[in-house]
């Protein structure tokens, strides 16, 4: 089952996600999506990084920490009830089926 996180309407939601880069600055792509992690990639992508930097993000969705050190936690600004649901953090480690997938449940009150 998903780990549950809570936030209040109008506040910021924080969804933690971490990995350990193989070497400093040796990043792997990460995607965040709304909905449970599918077999590949992320569905309904809200933010994505590549091997170097953030390369896609949408309004209100931000990386919250020092992603170059493996902190790829997500901040959702000014949440509404519509933001409730499952979010997928996917660490896209090279190789077949090597990805680390984390499903996080956001509950808005």
């Amino acid at each position: 089952s998903e780990v549950e996180y809570r936030a209040e309407v109008g506040q910021n939601a924080y969804l933690p996600c971490f990995y350990t880069p193989a070497a400093p600055g040796n990043l792997v792509p990460v995607c965040w999506g709304k909905g449970a992690c599918p077999v590949f990639e992320c569905g309904n992508v809200v933010l994505r990084t590549d091997e170097r930097d953030v390369n896609y993000w949408t309004s209100r969705y931000w990386l919250n920490g020092d992603f170059r050190k493996g902190d790829v936690s997500l901040t959702i600004e000014n949440v509404t009830l519509a933001d409730s649901g499952i979010y997928c953090c996917r660490i896209q480690i090279p190789g077949i089926m090597n990805d680390e997938k984390f499903n996080l449940k956001l509950v808005i009150k």
Epitope: N12, W62, T75, E77
Partner: antibody, heavy 122, light 109 residues
């Protein structure tokens, strides 16, 4: 081309107030965290305050907390710093700086304005 | 709160290599950014995320970060590199952006 242009500096007496502005152009203003950084004459850089892209979160150095207020008007592409209860030690060049992209905090300062001088003296 | 310690000054002959250190408790666990500031001018970002170089910054500039020390290295130093250099980190514990005290790089001759 990214441009940041500060204004509003000048001479003010201790205890007085001043409002700095930073007009931004060349990028989608609301997508970036912004900061104010100052430099006293002959001294190093000191971060003063930061604000998230939407303006929903603000952060302050301990030295200015309760006296300075950062804000932004995304419809005008403008960043502000309201400075109250000014002290002699607030004398500095104040720079407006744009944070890095895709990060809530704007981890580093990618672009800087030329600065505006604030002098607090009687 | 993290304190960033830089040497006040570094001198180097033209064509040689200059190294400017930035010390801090476990600074290797944070991303370090470096700025160059020439007299009467605004700072310019020269290194970000420990070792990345913005476009327009010569390859002579490089950075590293490990343990308790981050280092800015300038190879084949030129007279135009004479400036003040500042390291910077984002301290997420305090939500403060921190600068080192700055290092004045003097190019001899």
């Amino acid at each position: 081309e990214v441009q940041l242009l500060e204004s509003g500096g000048g001479l003010v007496q201790p205890g007085g107030s001043l409002r700095l502005s930073c007009a931004a152009s060349g990028f989608t203003f609301s997508s970036y965290a912004m900061s104010w950084v100052r430099q006293a004459p002959g001294k190093g850089l000191e971060w003063v305050s930061a604000i998230s892209g939407s303006g929903g979160s603000t952060y302050y150095a301990d030295s200015v907390k309760g006296r300075f207020t950062i804000s932004r008007d995304n419809s005008k592409n403008t960043l502000y710093l309201q400075m109250n209860s000014l002290r002699a030690e607030d004398t500095a060049v104040y720079y407006c700086a744009r944070g890095s992209y895709g990060t809530y905090y704007g981890n580093y300062f990618e672009y800087w304005g030329r600065g505006t001088l604030v002098t607090v003296s009687s | 709160q993290t304190v960033l310690t830089q040497p006040p000054s570094v001198s180097v002959a033209p064509g040689k290599t200059a190294s400017i250190s930035c010390g801090g408790d476990n600074i290797g666990g944070k991303s370090v950014h470096w700025y160059q500031q020439k007299p009467g001018q605004a700072p310019v970002l020269v290194i970000y995320y420990d070792s990345d170089r913005p476009s327009g910054i010569p390859q002579r500039f490089s950075g590293s970060n490990s343990g308790n020390t981050a280092t800015l290295t300038i190879h084949r130093v030129e007279a135009g590199d004479e400036a003040d250099y500042y390291c910077q980190v984002l301290d997420r514990r305090s939500d403060h952006w921190l600068f080192g005290g700055g290092t004045k790089l003097t190019v001899l001759g």
